[in-house]
Interface confidence: medium
């Protein structure tokens, strides 16, 4: 239904606290360099304005769209051009082009320092002094670094952050309580960020139809007892919600997400037997719980999929008369039977089925032609199963850090032109798949591995798109979203690459490495490893092991030395010489 004042409508639906959080996220995602204080001032102005519209929907400007109101606020910021350069050109445009322009200027890799968590005591002090401001800073810092973070989910993580601090700041050993809990929240949030970026990429590059297909497969896996009509309704709603969030319509997105949660809880009987526990929770937790819900039990009496989609003589008629509906039904039926497959794999199978019907329904004897289609799925299913098996075996043998290094070598060989920081970030994330997925039961491994890898590779594609340097990466990133992971897996050593010159300074280290936290130390070593591979793309595993082992010993030795600086200065050049020799 239409409302006189969109902003008043959203304020009333969402409540002041969530409204303010979402406006802060929106501004932080659009203008990623602005300090918190500047954004919070704008948030307060927008909130005050929304309140005047709640009091009187006919008040001046209350009938303007939210994009217009937000855009006008952003464009009124002094020195916008000084800080944001050509983004300021957006302000010359009218809506909806102005918002489109803002979206195009979102930076997936903003030049911001890594978010440093303050020391426990300091954190607790500032949290207890002003919890609202503390959590506001959290929203701002995460949103500006992740301009596509799913806004209502970010509010949920802020709530989690709040819970952890409330609990731990009363403990005697605050750090012991905070560190593991905040690490867990951070890990989940980072995964959520790459997953949502993938959804927005899907929406931006391939449109709503592609996203809806993804949603149909996912919902069918989770709710195998729901009928196709119900799954279609849920998928349509989820598509709309994600489109809104990816498009910067965060208030509408959060409001619609809450509505969907309400609908699901009111219709549990036709959706899933697993929803009740989620439905007793408050709104943010309820939506999050529903998004993470375990799969319902598969109905016991499902007939063979072949009956409807291979053996039936009307297959070509069904397909010709309503292609999307028929393919949607196929995707639904296949997905509800296979919670053990990744969504990417299910979409590849649906694509294969579609291609088979396109070919066969034009031939003289269609049933004979499409009769073997299910057997032809086998290699498509085996490929990711083998990927999971070999990678999980490697992870179990090497552990997370060793596995990350193996992945780093592999990807540096595939795309040595890509910048080292990007390769290290991608390999570290790809390497985490082991810890995340390989410990799961067999039936959950494939969906976990492949859908996680797809999201990480999407991040690599997004960063590469900004400064394209590798033809191979461009090729894999340009194709269909569901073919990306197999495309990257199939890449081999780039034979066209001219090895990088050996630069001693790249492998020169100083005593500051000794005081770095473990994670930063690992990154330094992995940076050196990537540079080694760029220098010698065809180095053997043994050669790399020798050099990296030598490097680790060197760092260990010098960090234990009485005169660390002197040790690094004298031993460093020896290490470089030995490394050159080992790789000759």
């Amino acid at each position: 239904e239409a409302h006189k004042s969109e902003i008043a409508h959203r304020f009333k639906d969402l409540g002041e606290q969530h409204f303010k959080g979402l406006v802060l996220i929106a501004f932080s995602q659009y203008l990623q360099k602005c300090p918190y204080e500047e954004h919070i001032k704008l948030v307060q102005e927008v909130t005050d304005f929304a309140k005047t519209c709640v009091a009187d929907e006919n008040a001046e400007n209350c009938d303007k769209s939210i994009h217009t109101l937000f855009g006008d606020k952003l464009c009124a910021i002094p020195k916008l051009r000084d800080n944001y350069g050509e983004l300021a050109d957006c302000c010359a445009k009218q809506e909806p082009e102005r918002n489109e322009c803002f979206l195009q200027h979102k930076d997936d890799n903003p030049n911001l320092p890594p978010f440093q968590r303050p020391e426990a005591e300091a954190m607790c002090t500032s949290f207890q002094e002003n919890p609202t401001s503390f959590l506001g800073h959290y929203l701002h810092e995460v949103a500006r670094r992740h301009p596509y973070f799913y806004a209502p989910e970010l509010l949920y993580y802020a709530e989690k952050y709040n819970e952890v601090l409330t609990q731990c700041c009363t403990e005697s050993d605050k750090a012991a309580c905070l560190t593991p809990k905040l690490d867990a929240v951070k890990e989940k949030a980072l995964v959520a960020a790459v997953r949502q970026r993938m959804k927005c990429s899907s929406m931006q590059r391939f449109g709503e139809r592609a996203f809806k297909a993804w949603a149909v497969a996912r919902m069918s896996q989770r709710f195998p007892n729901a009928e196709f009509a119900e799954i279609t309704k849920l998928a349509t709603d989820v598509t709309k919600i994600n489109k809104e969030c990816c498009h910067g319509d965060l208030l509408e997105c959060a409001d619609d997400r809450a509505e969907l949660a309400k609908y699901m809880c009111e219709n549990q009987a036709t959706i899933s037997s697993k929803l009740q526990a989620c439905c007793d929770k408050p709104v943010l937790q309820k939506s999050q719980c529903l998004a993470e819900i375990e799969h319902d039990n598969i109905p016991a009496d499902l007939p063979s999929i072949a009956a409807d989609f291979v053996e039936d003589k009307e297959v070509c008629k069904n397909y010709a008369e309503a292609k999307d509906v028929f393919l949607g039904t196929f995707l639904y039926e296949y997905s509800r039977r296979h919670p053990d497959y990744s969504v990417s794999l299910l979409l590849r199978l649906a694509k294969k089925y579609e291609a088979t019907l396109e070919k066969c329904c034009a031939e003289g004897d269609p049933p004979a032609c499409y009769g073997t289609v299910l057997a032809e799925f086998q290699p498509l299913v085996e490929e990711p199963k083998n990927l999971v098996k070999t990678n999980c075996e490697l992870y179990e043998k090497l552990g997370e850090y060793g596995f990350q290094n193996a992945v780093l070598v592999r990807y540096t060989q595939k795309a040595p032109q890509v910048s080292t920081p990007t390769l290290v970030e991608a390999a570290r994330n790809l390497g985490r798949v082991g810890t995340k997925c390989c410990t799961l039961p067999e039936a959950q491994r494939l969906p976990c591995v492949e859908d996680y890898l797809s999201a990480i590779l999407n991040r690599l594609c997004v960063l590469h798109e900004k400064t394209p340097v590798s033809e191979k990466v461009t090729k894999c990133c340009s194709g269909s979203l569901v073919e990306r992971r197999p495309c990257f897996s199939a890449l081999t050593v780039d034979e066209t690459y001219v090895p990088k010159e050996f630069k001693a300074e790249t492998f020169t280290f100083h005593s500051d490495i000794c005081t770095l936290p473990d994670k930063e130390k690992q990154i330094k070593k992995q940076t050196a490893l990537a540079e080694l591979v760029k220098h010698k793309p065809k180095a053997t595993e043994d050669q790399l092991k020798t050099v990296m082992g030598d490097f680790a010993q060197f760092v260990d030795k010098c960090c234990k030395a009485a005169d660390k600086d002197n040790c690094f200065a004298t031993e460093g050049p020896n290490l470089v010489a030995r490394s050159k020799e080992a790789l000759a």
Epitope: F309, N318, E321, A322, F326, T329
Partner: nanobody
């Protein structure tokens, strides 16, 4: 759950017409793939005609094409089978069957339809 109740059967002469009705309750008929099957004495159930749920795509057995027409009235939640030019070999018990959640029939196999009416007898004889 879907309940189906057929009516409209009876005795008719060859060349005559009949209109069968199937009233559905428990679910909207336009969301459901529905079909008519028939069973002649001593034979198995045979697909006659079907219509998709949500999309009005119709399906007919070769033996009835051009003579029978399947339709539905969503406001009355009722399925119909208009039978013209009836022949003695059309004599059978006619059943209405439903596959909820199916946008298309996607099958003429009786076993794949979970919901059935009790049937109405059609006799074509002079």
């Amino acid at each position: 759950e879907v309940q189906l109740l057929e009516s409209g059967g009876g005795l008719v002469q060859p060349g005559g017409s009949l209109r069968l009705s199937c009233a559905a309750s428990g679910r909207y008929i336009d969301e459901t793939a529905v079909a008519w099957f028939r069973q002649a004495p001593g034979k198995g159930r045979e697909f006659v005609a079907g219509i998709g749920g949500g999309v009005d795509i119709t399906y007919y057995a070769d033996s009835v094409k051009g003579r029978f027409t399947i339709s539905r009235d969503n406001s009355k939640n009722t399925l119909y089978l208009q039978m013209n030019s009836l022949r003695p070999e059309d004599t059978a018990v006619y059943y209405c069957a439903a596959r909820p959640g199916r946008p298309l029939i996607t099958s003429k196999v009786a076993d794949l339809y979970p919901y059935w009416g009790q049937g109405t007898l059609v006799t074509v004889s002079s």
